[in-house]
């Protein structure tokens, strides 16, 4: 058993049929010694008396808010949560496996630049009685500070018969140099509590590996005389690290119709302009990627050919 | 806007081409190592990230773009000083900071070159003959060093009398390649920045 936060405790249980469970001793936070009784949740049934209560925690029915009282007055609470371990593996029932970039990916994180600011998100089908708490650091043995905000519900989607909820959090490394060469990864830890179930999820990464620039901005077309060709130009996204001559991007320019199966024109360039062949009912799209360290491509920025 | 340097016309900066080749060569070599040593811990997640130049050179700090010198997090250690006769910029007005930056890059390359050559000598003794260093990568390191043209004491190639542990050598190769790739990215960024100055 360990303390998650004040008056909230996590009991770690090996979860299998007829498991013996864990013996837990609760102590009432009071100077009083006599006349103390214990109850669980909203029940008025007295579970025991005295300053300490010993319980055998085996299942979710044994978890919950234990309260010690004296003469009708509440003295203190202890909330017990369960953390299940099945076949030596901690449960991951609360969050959905996003399977990208590999199986057992519950947290996904991205950074728009090298400033040390990043966003992580996760998915769940649970809509109520759900709380998250996020901590982060650079390295684990001698951790350096990363400050994370509160996790918020950022999107809701319908997936077949189920509703899916996306939560996200923004974090900022306290003293980040955009030009630094990372040798210690960022660690992100998410505590998830659904009703009386506790789970924790972690992700470890270098900012350089989660870079995904914003799409290029200000796409413009200039038709070339006596030709089917069009000159398309664009600018670096505002959120990208500066100076751009140091943090350079490379670009992919594509002309394609509405369907992915349609024919297309595609060219890669380090410049902020390119010449492509425009077709009726097609769109010109441009996306960006770090020129020197191949992490993710940005989303496409698009303009119609006409 | 940038470091106070006089440079020739854009595209005339001779080290840019070499640094692009360097990044390409080390990336290819790392990819080859990851494929060949698939049953060894050779991915970014599996290895310890060590920097053999730590406390010996300070390339990131010495080569910091002017715009980032206002960022206190980028200025934690700028105490290294090097020989200042680099030729990459083909200009007499090369600033002191610039020379410091280019000589730091030169020292990095020299240290990695020695490590790689020592390691290759060990790998050539491996009866499995599983992996060797790409001669192209070694050649590209050499070309960039020549383009930088700094005079510096020759570092003797380390020779080891004990029987090499090939497993450890291959893991060390992975660690070295990962670190060198990250340094090659920094070098490429620096050269691109100087070329645009």
């Amino acid at each position: 058993i360990w303390e998650l936060k004040k008056d909230v405790y996590v009991v770690e249980l090996d979860w299998y049929p007829d498991a013996p469970g864990e013996m837990v001793v609760l102590t009432c936070d009071t100077p009083e010694e006599d006349g103390i009784t214990w109850t669980l949740d909203q029940s008025s049934e007295v579970l025991g008396s005295g300053k300490t209560l010993t319980i055998q925690v085996k299942e979710f029915g044994d978890a919950g808010q234990y309260t010690c009282h004296k003469g009708g007055e509440v003295l203190s609470h202890s909330l017990l949560l369960l953390h299940k371990k099945e076949d030596g593996i901690w449960s991951t029932d609360i969050l959905k496996d996003q399977k990208e970039p590999k199986n057992k990916t519950f947290l996904r994180c991205e950074a728009k630049n090298y400033s040390g600011r990043f966003t992580c998100w996760w998915l769940t089908t649970i809509s109520t009685d759900l709380t998250f708490s996020v901590k982060s650091s650079r390295g684990s043995s001698d951790p350096q500070g990363v400050t994370c905000g509160a996790a918020t519900l950022s999107a809701e989607r319908v997936r077949g018969d189920n509703k899916e909820y996306e939560y996200s959090v923004e974090c900022q490394e306290d003293s980040a140099c955009p030009a630094a060469e990372e040798s210690l990864p960022i660690e992100v830890m998410v505590d998830a509590v659904h009703k009386l179930k506790y789970e924790n999820y972690t992700s470890s990464f270098f900012i350089r590996d989660i870079i995904k620039p914003d799409p290029p901005k200000n796409l413009q077309l200039k038709p070339l005389k006596n030709s089917r060709q069009v000159e398309v130009s664009w600018e670096y996204p505002d959120t990208w690290s500066t100076p751009h001559s140091y943090f350079s991007l490379t670009f992919c320019v594509q002309v394609q119709g509405k369907s992915k199966r349609e024919k297309k024109d595609r060219v890669f360039t380090d410049k902020t302009s390119a010449t492509v062949i425009c077709r009726k009912n097609a769109s010109i799209s441009v996306r960006a990627q770090d020129r020197y360290y191949s992490s993710s491509w940005s989303e496409w920025a698009s303009v119609p050919c006409s | 806007r940038n470091l106070p340097v006089a440079t020739p016309d854009p595209g005339m900066f001779p080290c840019l081409h070499h640094s692009q080749n360097l990044l390409r060569a080390v990336s290819n070599m790392l990819q080859k190592a990851r494929q060949t040593l698939e049953f060894y811990p050779c991915t970014s997640e599996e290895i310890d990230h060590e920097d053999i130049t730590k406390d010996k050179t300070s390339t990131v700090e010495a080569c910091l773009p002017l715009e980032l010198t206002k960022n206190e997090s980028c200025l934690n250690s700028r105490e290294t000083s090097f020989i200042t006769n680099g030729s990459c910029l083909a200009s007499r007005k090369t600033s002191f900071m610039m020379a410091l930056c280019l000589s730091s890059i030169y020292e990095d390359l020299k240290m990695y070159q020695v490590e790689f050559k020592t390691m290759n000598a060990k790998l050539l003794m491996d009866p499995k003959r599983q992996i060797f260093l790409d001669q192209n990568m070694l050649a590209v390191i050499d070309e960039l060093m020549q383009a930088l043209n700094f005079n510096s004491e020759t570092v003797p190639q380390k020779s080891s009398l004990e029987e090499p542990d090939f497993y450890k050598t291959k893991i060390k190769l992975c660690i070295l390649l990962h670190a060198f790739r990250i340094r090659a990215v920094t070098i490429d960024r620096v050269m691109s920045y100087l070329n645009a100055s």
Epitope: K263, K264, D265, R266, V267, F268, T275, I277 | -
Partner: antibody, heavy 118, light 107 residues
Framework: QVQLVQSGAEVKKPGSSVKVSCKAS????????LHWVRQAPGQGQEWMGW????????EYAPKFQGRVTITADESTSTAYMELSSLRSEDTAVYYC???????????WGQGTLVTVSS | DIVMTQSPLSLPVTPGEPASISCRAS??????LHWYQQKPGQAPRLLIY???QSISGVPSRFSGSGSGTDFTLTISSLQPEDFATYYC?????????FGQGTKVEIK
């Protein structure tokens, strides 16, 4: 199985014209760009131009501009390349090639040898 | 026009040995570079597109690398059926242009 089948070899006099055909099978004809590339004996390839069979748009290499005409007939899934004012240096194997991507070629015809000789 | 220069023009190789062919562009072409194999009397066959992207059905011993002006096609271990002429082609701008070819011959 996508295939491009070209017309047979031709012998032409200098100053005349040649029209080579390229019939496509497998896949929808208008879903691909169609190019013509030639290869003179012992030489490398030379790109001549492309056509978008969907709308008849064409683009030609400046070297052949004014001498080459690329057309397409959607009803027969056939593309044509006509080269006029032939000279001896036009002796080459002419290939048609196609792809959904405009700028490179994933399927080629078997080639048509055009010999220009007086 | 962008000029593509291949080297060497002829490459004698022992079967089972690796081979590398270089292609240089007269100006930077990013990764807009494709590789073809051609055997005598046959049409070219696409091997690699956009410098390093492999084609399904092409053996994994063929790999491409490079960007900017310098590109390499590598055959990790030459098989008898790999003896052929190899061409690079740039698609950075029109007109599309090819290298003059590298003939890989049996040593």
């Amino acid at each position: 199985q996508v295939q491009l089948v070209q017309s047979g070899a031709e012998v032409k006099k200098p100053g005349s014209s040649v029209k080579v055909s390229c019939k496509a099978s497998g896949g929808t004809f208008s879903d691909y760009y169609l190019h013509w590339v030639r290869q003179a004996p012992g030489q490398g390839q030379e790109w001549m131009g492309w056509i978008d069979p969907e709308n008849g748009d064409t683009e030609y290499a400046p070297k052949f501009q004014g001498r080459v005409t690329i057309t397409a007939d959607e009803s027969t899934s056939t593309a044509y390349m006509e080269l006029s004012s032939l000279r001896s240096e036009d002796t080459a194997v002419y290939y048609c090639a196609r792809n959904k991507e405009l700028r490179y070629f994933d399927v080629w015809g078997q080639g048509t040898l055009v010999t220009v000789s007086s | 026009d962008i000029v593509m220069t291949q080297s060497p023009l002829s490459l004698p190789v022992t079967p089972g040995e690796p081979a590398s062919i270089s292609c240089r562009a007269s100006q930077s072409i990013s990764i807009n570079l494709h590789w073809y194999q051609q055997k005598p009397g046959q049409a070219p066959r696409l091997l690699i597109y956009f410098a390093s992207q492999s084609i399904s059905g092409v053996p994994s011993r063929f790999s491409g690398s490079g960007s900017g002006t310098d590109f390499t096609l590598t055959i990790s271990s030459l098989q008898p059926e790999d003896f052929a002429t190899y061409y690079c082609q740039q698609s950075n701008s029109f007109p599309l242009t090819f290298g003059q070819g590298t003939k890989v011959e049996i040593k």
